[in-house]
Each structure stands twice: as C-alpha cells, then as structure tokens.
C-alpha cells in the first residue's frame, strides 16, 4: 500500500527574468526513491536518478539547474514558463508518487510565494 505523501511548494509566482526553485518532498513512507522526473505539462525538464545522477533535457540546459537536493532551479524566467510543473517520484516498492506545482511568471515585482500544500 502506498502510504507516502508529496509536499510541494504549491502555487508560486516569480518575476520575469528571475529564477525560482521547484521543490517536492516525499514523506510518510520508507520506500526508496530511485528516480525523480521533473516535467512541465508534457515536456521532460530533468531527471535525477539515484545511480546516474542528473540529466537535464538539452532544450532546457541553459535555463534549468539541478537542485537543491531533488529540486529544480528555473532561471531567466519568461511569461511562457507559466504553467503546471510535476515532480514524479519513482520509488521501490511503493511505485510512483506525483506532486504538482503551479508557477505564474509575472511582469512586475508583485510576485509572491504561495503556501505549501500536500498531495497524497
């Protein structure tokens, strides 16, 4: 039975041209995390594998940095970066856990971080 929950940075906003850290945390399970995939809608951004380390998709190499931890840093943000981001935790023996983050990239300096929330 899957007992874990994923806590994410939730709904967040950031300024155009700035950077943001996408973070997820898996808790309430002893399952081993073998890999974390980061996706934006239907595009692979990056993968962190327990054995192989990080792989950043070539088309995002200039604007995506691995970490901190299993998180992902997006740099040089544009309005087109607004949207849903998913952290997909592959674990053994539990299986797959998915967390969702919504990022809004704003033109002005009114960006604020949203509250943290949990996805079971």
């Amino acid at each position: 039975m899957m007992t874990g929950t994923i806590e994410t940075t939730g709904n967040i906003s950031a300024e155009k041209g700035g950077s943001i850290i996408l973070q997820c945390h898996l808790s309430s399970t002893t399952a081993q995390v073998t890999q974390v995939n980061w996706e934006q809608q239907d595009q692979l951004l990056a993968i962190c594998n327990a054995d192989l380390g990080w792989h950043i998709s070539p088309s995002f190499k200039d604007r995506v940095a691995p970490g901190p931890g299993l998180g992902l840093t997006l740099q040089s943000l544009t309005v087109n970066d607004t949207g849903e981001y998913f952290c997909i935790y592959h674990t053994y023996p539990d299986g797959t856990y998915t967390g969702r983050i919504f990022l809004e990239v704003l033109e002005s300096s009114v960006a604020e971080h949203g509250a943290r929330f949990q996805i079971p």
Partner: antibody, heavy 118, light 107 residues
Framework: EVQLLESGGGLVQPGGSLRLSCAAS????????MHWVRQAPGKGLEWVAS????????YYADSVKGRFTISRDNSKNTLYLQMNSLRAEDTAVYYC???????????WGQGTLVTVSS | DIQMTQSPSSLSASVGDRVTITCRAS??????LNWYQQKPGKAPKLLIY???SLQSGVPSRFSGSGSGTDFTLTISSLQPEDFATYYC?????????FGGGTKVEIK
C-alpha cells in the same frame, strides 16, 4: 566505449530451452536498467523483458511471461535471458539494450539469432 | 497496453527532401516517446528521446516534436545515409511498445 555483446543464440527445437547472455563493458553496468528486445525476420521491434539496475524488479511481455526469465549478475557485468518452452514464433534476433533513466535505449548489442524449428 | 501507430508504413523520397513521419499513441504518454533508425542487418540507433531531445552525435537535420498522443519525426534535408527504417517507441508504461516502422526508400 560502451559495448554490449550477445551470445547463446542458435537453432533449437520447439519446446526446447536456450540461455542468452549479454556481456557489457565500457560503463558502470550496475547503474543501468537493461532490456531484451527482439525482431522476427522481416518484422518490427518487440520488447521482451527488462530488469532494474539493482535487480529489484523485472518485467515481461505477455507473449513470453512464464516462459522467459531475465536476470543479471552485476559482479560479472552480464545480462541473461533464460528461454524455456520455446515456440516457432520466438524465432528472432534478440538484442540486449542499455536504458538510462528507464526511458530510452541509448545502446544496443549487435544481436544474436534464435531459430526455433524442428 | 499502449498501441503505437506509425504512418506512413513506407515512403519514397529524394535526397534533399523534407521527410515527416508521424506516430500516434492509443493514450497520452506525455513526452515518453523515442525514435530509432535501423539499417538492414544492423541494430537500431537512437535518434530522438523524450519526444524532442536530440541524442548526442545525431545530425541536427533530425528533429522530434509532439506530446500527449501525437508525435512527429522530421528529417529536414534527406541525405543518402538516411535511407532506413524508423521506429517510434513509448516508455510511459510497461509493456514498452514500438510502432510498426516506416521504411524510407529512394525515389
């Protein structure tokens, strides 16, 4: 240089058994998931089986489930496919393949031909 | 199981032509789609992974696009060495499945 070298193919009668091996070199074998993919003469590619890097999980195509067993020996950098109760439709070139991040096949062996015929 | 449907099954083209091959999944596979090239008597070779990422060492005339259920492999200017069979493959879920292949022949 990454190398995958299959062996063990040959002619076998229906109902017989074969064990394929794939010797890996040029990379840290124990860090990668490995797959077997086959191709019948003149046909397309068919995934057969896969095994995680730490041997914790194995997966099989329905067409071979219960007859084929995938395994690996990380200390010997070798992947295996034990094939039992072979059928004529198992006739194919069998490729071993390296799969980083459980996502794409970036290296293939040269293949070994298995012919099941009486 | 996820079915992968490739079209066309074969095509004839000339050197310098722009060639497009499509692959459709029977359900959404996000960007878990890879493209391979195979020449007669040889093992397949990875061209594109994760729908649009060019594998290291593959010429830039190859490109991939799409997400969800519909994907495209494009060869911007066909070269003599590109005449081969091309396969798509989904790695979204087990069993992994391949398209039926597209044979690119010389016109």
């Amino acid at each position: 240089e990454v190398q995958l070298l299959e062996s063990g193919g040959g002619l076998v009668q229906p109902g017989g058994s074969l064990r394929l091996s794939c010797a890996a070199s040029g990379f840290t074998f124990s860090s990668y998931s490995m797959h077997w993919v086959r191709q019948a003469p003149g046909k397309g590619l068919e995934w057969v089986a896969s095994i995680k890097s730490d041997t914790s999980s194995t997966y099989y195509a329905d067409s071979v489930k219960g007859r084929f067993t995938i395994s690996r020996d990380n200390s010997k950098n070798t992947l295996y496919l034990q094939m039992n109760s072979l059928r004529a439709e198992d006739t194919a070139v069998y490729y071993c393949a390296r799969v980083p991040y459980d996502y794409w096949i970036d290296y293939w062996g040269q293949g070994t031909l298995v012919t099941v015929s009486s | 199981d996820i079915q992968m449907t490739q079209s066309p099954s074969s095509l004839s083209a000339s050197v310098g032509d722009r060639v497009t091959i499509t692959c459709r999944a029977s359900q959404s596979i996000s960007s878990y789609l890879n493209w391979y090239q195979q020449k007669p008597g040889k093992a397949p070779k990875l061209l594109i992974y994760a729908a649009s990422s060019l594998q290291s060492g593959v010429p830039s005339r190859f490109s991939g696009s799409g997400s969800g259920t519909d994907f495209t492999l494009t060869i911007s200017s066909l070269q003599p060495e590109d005449f081969a069979t091309y396969y798509c493959q989904q790695s979204y879920s087990t069993p992994l499945t391949f398209g039926g292949g597209t044979k690119v022949e010389i016109k």
